[in-house]
């Protein structure tokens, strides 16, 4: 038995996780660069 609502929900969740992870990496990189420049 397979139901699309679980795949839709899980794909949406994982995309949000990936975006959050990417943003955290970018912001973390910028912060480190700022500290380094000081």
């Amino acid at each position: 038995h397979s139901d699309g609502i679980f795949t839709d929900s899980y794909s949406r969740y994982r995309k949000q996780m990936a975006v959050k992870k990417y943003l955290a990496a970018v912001l973390g990189k910028r912060y480190k660069q700022r500290v380094k420049n000081k």
Epitope: S2, I5, F6, Y10, R14, Q16, K20, K21
Partner: antibody, heavy 117, light 113 residues
Framework: QQLEQSGGGAEGGLVKPGGSLELCCKA??????????MCWVRQAPGKGLEWIGC????????DYASWVNGQFTLSRDIDQSTGCLQLNSLTVADTAMYYC??????WGPGTLVTVSS | AQVLTQTPSSVSAAVGGTVTINCQSS????????LSWFQQKPGQPPKGLIA???TLASGVPSRFKGSGSGTQFTLTISGVQCDDAAAYYC?????????????FGGGTEVVVK
């Protein structure tokens, strides 16, 4: 669409404490280009469900439950449409039915792992 | 790590009665609504009933209803049938960056008289 599980065995894969075992899950009926998260869940006899971890079939990115602590490893073979769970340093407490699931949507029938001396 | 506390652990209901299962999460599930409910019968893998706290899977009878948000969730079975005798589990999706991605509730055994 279905998930076929191998390793261990529906009738019971018997492993000695300290031993290792690889469980695999083959997806069939999917588009070869489709990517998804293959997750693994276990259930000790008479107990509840316990999340182990997930692997993304596209990039191979993984997430594990904190209790796994390096004891188990997830891998995938895109060409074979297969995801595997390597179980190491097994103890009696790892005796359980191990399920693979695609996005918590489609589930494999489970494979029983029995750890006993 | 996060904890999903499911209550009660077992419940008995007469045919036609109502069953309420609670799932309390600490911390909140991601986006306040990423919680699913599963039904499991002996010797079978779990079957998805409800996703996103309240969205019913296709083929699941309308007597099953999911509600709640954030930390408190409920699965209600109205007009219980013999076929509903099973174990029920909630599954939370969390912020993987700060904790485990997922956790299951301890389960609730539903006995139908």
């Amino acid at each position: 669409q279905q998930l076929e599980q191998s390793g261990g065995g529906a009738e019971g894969g018997l492993v000695k404490p300290g031993g290792s075992l690889e469980l695999c899950c083959k997806a069939s009926g999917f588009s070869l280009s489709s990517t998804y998260w293959m997750c693994w869940v276990r259930q000790a006899p008479g107990k509840g469900l316990e999340w182990i971890g997930c692997i993304y079939t596209g990039s191979g990115s993984t997430d594990y439950a904190s209790w796994v602590n390096g004891q188990f490893t997830l891998s995938r073979d895109i060409d074979q449409s297969t995801g595997c769970l390597q179980l190491n340093s097994l103890t009696v407490a790892d005796t359980a039915m191990y399920y693979c699931t695609k996005n918590f949507d489609l589930w494999g029938p489970g494979t029983l792992v029995t750890v006993s001396s | 790590a996060q904890v999903l506390t499911q209550t009660p652990s077992s419940v008995s209901a007469a045919v036609g009665g109502t069953v309420t299962i609670n799932c309390q999460s600490s911390p909140s599930v991601y986006s306040n609504n990423y919680l699913s409910w599963f039904q499991q019968k002996p010797g079978q893998p779990p079957k998805g009933l409800i996703a996103d706290a309240s969205t019913l899977a296709s083929g699941v009878p309308s007597r099953f209803k999911g509600s709640g948000s954030g930390t408190q969730f409920t699965l209600t079975i109205s007009g219980v049938q013999c076929d509903d005798a099973a174990a029920y589990y909630c599954l939370g999706y969390y912020d993987c960056g700060s904790t485990d991605c997922h956790a299951f509730g301890g389960g609730t055994e539903v006995v139908v008289k």
